[in-house]
Interface confidence: low
Amino acid sequence: AWELTILHTNDVHSRLEQTSEDSSKCVNASRCMGGVARLFTKVQQIRRAEPNVLLLDAGDQYQGTIWFTVYKGAEVAHFMNALRYDAMALGNHEFDNGVEGLIEPLLKEAKFPILSANIKAKGPLASQISGLYLPYKVLPVGDEVVGIVGYTSKETPFLSNPGTNLVFEDEITALQPEVDKLKTLNVNKIIALGHSGFEMDKLIAQKVRGVDVVVGGHSNTFLYTGNPPSKEVPAGKYPFIVTSDDGRKVPVVQAYAFGKYLGYLKIEFDERGNVISSHGNPILLNSSIPEDPSIKADINKWRIKLDNYSTQELGKTIVYLDGSSQSCRFRECNMGNLICDAMINNNLRHTDEMFWNHVSMCILNGGGIRSPIDERNNGTITWENLAAVLPFGGTFDLVQLKGSTLKKAFEHSVHRYGQSTGEFLQVGGIHVVYDLSRKPGDRVVKLDVLCTKCRVPSYDPLKMDEVYKVILPNFLANGGDGFQMIKDELLRHDSGDQDINVVSTYISKMKVIYPAVEGRIKFSTGSH
């Protein structure tokens, strides 16, 4: 028997520095977690103690903090090289700055293979990107070889900016021939490493003949056997065992997100490459693990540019940006409109001639807007200003919801109106009229939404049975502020870009902004 240790991360999202327990900015260092310096300490400890170790990343290193905003992926290549990652799969967020934003900072600089079997380049891009990412890679480990085959969510064109010269194929269809190829090369230990979410990870384990282990990402799935060490609630045991169609037990793993845990899986193979046993657990990277001093020093050196950036002007406002709780928790506020407009703008994807865009709607809890911005400071808007407005380090995500769920959400928005509570919704691509004289749960008297399948966008009444795409904060997607109906009834959820980054990019693009209060949210009394 031959034993392999797989160390894995996924959805790190730019958390190069240690973070608080909820993966936001570290405040009290003695209680902070994660970060590449601490990760390196643990990885090195395991490499010294165990003979056959692979360090793998399942995608979405890009996007999430000011580190990515400033360094645009160069930080990912630099620190992953420093940690000596063995392989990485491409995630959807690796395309956030277009294909060029992937090729130059990461693909050309990485000293480890970057993988995806289901992304096919065409046209002029094919020769430019050739060899920079691979469908699979055979890695020598000790006196054996291990095949790693990569995959990426086929929804990436809707979630990021891969352009028109990359085709995202069905994962299972694309993986099978690559695994078959590995078998012909006498590689009998094969890991599928990818970024399509836990449901697809399980399907790959079940359907792709020859895959021995699946290491996944995208769904931020936390798996754990036994008593979990922090706040995350396990979605199943670690590893999660799937019996494949050909009767093999295939371990599937994921390691939550944000570099908070290091996935640790021990696999025992027989001489024919069959998995005999698998066990392990994610390791919580808490303050009991010291930060490696050399990596920490490097982080501090790179940090200087970030501090300079946060006070630089992104753009100007010529109007007061009203982000006060007195406005945003009671009525339409222009800060809410600005943020929602930025959220939609960030999701412009012309993937189908029938649609001007795939999504037109935004909702945003008023309680998530934490500060106004005064235009009387020469109109200057900085990253620092935006961090006061959006201090929680969230993301703006894409969900699919039925009209009936949206209606419930808007009823919840005003079910206890007048108490300055955070659930009052700010909107984009939506016109809502409330009648507060009616009883809670029956206060929405008009709800019109902007069409997507149209050449001239216009507002139509919400249809209860129709499925709509909506951009919203991850906080709402997870049922925050009492929006349990969203969490319980959403049909799809894909995590998006860092909230501040979305707004800062929009302001930089527009240069001068002047959002108005324009009748997106109205109140009426009497008949309709």
Epitope: K202, L203, Q206, A235, G236, K237, I241, V242, T243, D245, D246, G247, R248, R272, N274
Partner: antibody
Framework: QVQLQQSGAELVRPGTSVKVSCKAS????????IEWIKQRPGQGLEWIGL????????NYIEKFKGKATLTADKSSSTAYMQLSSLTSEDSAVYFC?????????????WGQGTTLTVSS | DIQMTQSPASLAASVGETVTITCRAS??????LAWYQQKQGKSPQLLIY???TLEDGVPSRFSGSGSGTQYSMKINSMQPEDTATYFC?????????FGAGTKLELK
């Protein structure tokens, strides 16, 4: 159509061994797991273990390790369960079942059962 | 090992009546639950898998639901041919374990 045909009833003495067979037909034998289940008269069902006919790999519940031995013959598409050191506690109906190939892995086809009576 | 607690142990129902059988797992089994029907002197037959997916050929009066540790199977109009013993089984973890069974008789 898929069928699992088990060997006939057995009456055996305590301390001896018995080998029960389960012949599969109507599907690719090596693509599915064969599971074995025990049912004592008027009792519930108790999982014994499984065999992967493709690889020969087995998995037993702790209490049946040393009691049951699972094997498979690919050429005849037959799975076998040998029970050793028999006592009256082993008197039961034994079923083989095929584990389905969809996610969740239920037992989609069962043999008709083999009745084992251990008596002196 | 994961324990499966099935209830009731037995019940009698009239034709057309709705019958509900429940199964509680000792820990979360993440929908990995199947229901089987066993008629007198016969081998069990698969009715429902993945907690709520009806096996091909099973009458639509049978349905399954549940999540986490709590699951149930419903027969929404009892028929004479439904007289049998019903077992739940978790397939989330090895060893696979069955409920003790519910004997359903015609009233």
């Amino acid at each position: 159509q898929v069928q699992l045909q088990q060997s006939g009833a057995e009456l055996v003495r305590p301390g001896t061994s018995v080998k029960v067979s389960c012949k599969a037909s109507g599907y690719a034998f090596t693509n599915y797991l064969i599971e074995w289940i025990k049912q004592r008269p008027g009792q519930g069902l108790e999982w014994i273990g499984l065999i992967n006919p493709g690889s020969g790999g087995t998995n037993y519940i702790e209490k049946f390790k040393g009691k049951a031995t699972l094997t498979a013959d690919k050429s005849s598409s037959t799975a076998y369960m040998q029970l050793s050191s028999l006592t009256s506690e082993d008197s039961a109906v034994y079923f083989c079942a095929r584990r389905g190939d969809y996610y969740g892995n239920p037992f989609d086809y069962w043999g008709q059962g083999t009745t084992l009576t251990v008596s002196s | 090992d994961i324990q499966m607690t099935q209830s009731p142990a037995s019940l009698a129902a009239s034709v057309g009546e709705t019958v509900t059988i429940t199964c509680r797992a000792s820990e979360n089994i993440y929908y990995s639950l199947a229901w089987y029907q066993q008629k007198q002197g016969k081998s069990p037959q698969l009715l429902i898998y993945n907690a709520d997916t009806l096996e091909d050929g099973v009458p639509s009066r049978f349905s399954g639901s549940g999540s986490g540790t709590q699951y149930s199977m419903k027969i929404n109009s009892m028929q004479p041919e439904d007289t049998a013993t019903y077992f739940c089984k978790q397939a989330y973890d090895v060893p696979l374990t069955f409920g003790a069974g519910t004997k359903l008789e015609l009233k």
